[in-house]
Amino acid sequence: RAPRCRELPAQKWWHTGALYRIGDLQAFQGHGAGNLAGLKGRLDYLSSLKVKGLVLGPIHKNQKDDVAQTDLLQIDPNFGSKEDFDSLLQSAKKKSIRVILDLTPNYRGENSWFSTQVDTVATKVKDALEFWLQAGVDGFQVRDIENLKDASSFLAEWQNITKGFSEDRLLIAGTNSSDLQQILSLLESNKDLLLTSSYLSDSGSTGEHTKSLVTQYLNATGNRWCSWSLSQARLLTSFLPAQLLRLYQLMLFTLPGTPVFSYGDEIGLDAAALPGQPMEAPVMLWDESSFPDIPGAVSANMTVKGQSEDPGSLLSLFRRLSDQRSKERSLLHGDFHAFSAGPGLFSYIRHWDQNERFLVVLNFGDVGLSAGLQASDLPASASLPAKADLLLSTQPGREEGSPLELERLKLEPHEGLLLRFPYAA
């Protein structure tokens, strides 16, 4: 008799793929544009990235550091009207893109939470949650919660409101903290909270340290659903050298949890390459005309247009990974097992029941080397085969689809491999 199939876990929409943050509408759209109507015109692009949710804003009225002139129920007219927002919601729904609204109150000011008037602000947030849930948003994000006194109890209350409306609604909290204990204390009191933090930004870009951070986090959080990013808002290029961007994309898309990206991460958008642009929100490079300030500063291969035409680009890799992440059971909700490998390497298996299994091998170092996969670290349920098919490499040159002998597997500097192999009874 065939073995019984393992029961599928309940999957919420945010379990099925990546979230895409657009914190600054104007920077995202560029050319002096930057409103909700313009964003609606970019939804096809988001669809092409196969992201499941758009984390938008903040877009509410906020006069810097003035609590009285901060209205979480009103859209700043610079971004458009409530009608524009409703229209965006409808269009997004048609494309199966969920909309999460950032309600961080004092986003233009010094302290995101008006630290002297916490109770006033908390009431405003409560009212806003109810208002925007009725308006049809799929969830909320609040950032900088390390600046919010009694954050855990407020988050629990806001979570109750959100989940009370529908189990299908999501609350995301963001913190600048990278301290695991602080992160765990925030998570402890909030069962379904998705938390973005700077935890992984301390990885020091080495395989051993990244492995240790990931496994510590997963062990500490147990069965709860995680999110993976390098910060609550900033671009990957703020933390990583260009040669590690592909590696991190592969890792974020294949770890168990929801990958969260900022606009531009998919093309390696880098504020440092655009003189005069703010580090936290540089202009999105749709094409070479997106940054006219310095002629010639932007080459085609830095842009969405240029990378869309190049199958070997970072954008093409992002799209492929996003697609795999959203359709393969082992990547959607599979078990995770990390195991030892050569120096500078981080390798792990994702597997679910009798479905196709995935092996990820990441070389964080700038030295090519034999993978040295230590299969003895793995439980019997996740053993390695002699060969696995190469689904993709983060670097050009390998023949995709070809079987690779795992015992003789060698990685290039900064190369990541995604390999697949069938379940074997």
């Epitope: 050569g342 120096p343 700038d366 030295v367 080397l369 034999s370 040159g397 060698k410 500097p413």
Partner: antibody
Framework: EVQLVESGGGLVQPGGSLRLSCVAS????????MHWVRQAPGKGLVWVSR????????RYADSVKGRFTISRDNAKNTLYLQMNSLRAEDTAVYYC?????????????WGQGALVTVSS | QSVLTQPPSVSGAPGQRVAISCTGN?????????VHWYQQLPGTAPQLLIY???DRPSGVPDRFSGSKSGTSASLAITGLQAEDEAAYYC???????????FGGGTKLTVL
């Protein structure tokens, strides 16, 4: 056929400068990391420097740090080694070397070498 | 003083087997970095002989083999021939020096 041809060697006084060039052919130069390795007369091989395929990652041996500069021009299929503040102990044959792909960073092709003599 | 230690010389008669050792430490061979071997015939540039501890590039006879264990590696040559007379170098990467390191070289004499 992979070929690496060094030039620019010669006799130079201590404290002087020299620039070595290496023209590559027979492979896609812009896809490979490259190295310089030297060998003093009658002695063993010593690694000098390494540069990645687009020139953004560079490493040097401690003995040449601050004095030697590796660079490349992918449009010209050429690797360079600018050597300043030369010392007698820099006297050696300098090899231009390609780093193999999928070989664990082995050095799979070597030029014939350029002799640099530092003497007064 | 080389980071990787090789015997200065070895010798053997034609047809015999010889082995050349290469000893490192926990920041190079012992750390898991690959060992490669090069042959340098008199008056010529070195040539890659073994890569990734035990793999042979095409064109290298199967008389040459490599192995690695712990902090050491070894090159074995069977069926020794006169044309094998050369200097042999092992090479690896060293994480504490953050650079490529070579053994001092071993001169093989075919008697």
């Amino acid at each position: 056929e992979v070929q690496l041809v060094e030039s620019g060697g010669g006799l130079v006084q201590p404290g002087g400068s020299l620039r070595l060039s290496c023209v590559a052919s027979g492979f896609t130069f812009s896809s490979y990391w490259m190295h310089w390795v030297r060998q003093a007369p009658g002695k063993g091989l010593v690694w000098v420097s390494r540069i990645n395929s687009d020139g953004s990652i560079i490493r040097y041996a401690d003995s040449v740090k601050g004095r030697f500069t590796i660079s490349r021009d992918n449009a010209k299929n050429t690797l360079y080694l600018q050597m300043n503040s030369l010392r007698a102990e820099d006297t050696a044959v300098y090899y231009c070397v390609r780093e193999g792909r999928y070989t664990g960073s082995s050095l799979d092709y070597w030029g014939q070498g350029a002799l640099v003599t530092v003497s007064s | 003083q080389s980071v990787l230690t090789q015997p200065p010389s070895v010798s053997g008669a034609p047809g015999q087997r010889v082995a050349i050792s290469c000893t490192g430490n926990n920041s190079n061979i012992g750390a898991g970095y690959d060992v490669h071997w090069y042959q340098q015939l008199p008056g010529t540039a070195p040539q890659l002989l073994i890569y990734g501890n035990s793999d042979r590039p095409s064109g290298v006879p199967d008389r040459f083999s490599g192995s690695k264990s712990g902090t050491s590696a070894s090159l074995a040559i069977t069926g020794l021939q006169a044309e094998d007379e050369a200097a042999y170098y092992c090479q690896s990467y060293d994480s504490s020096l953050t650079g490529w390191v070579f053994g001092g070289g071993t001169k093989l004499t075919v008697l």
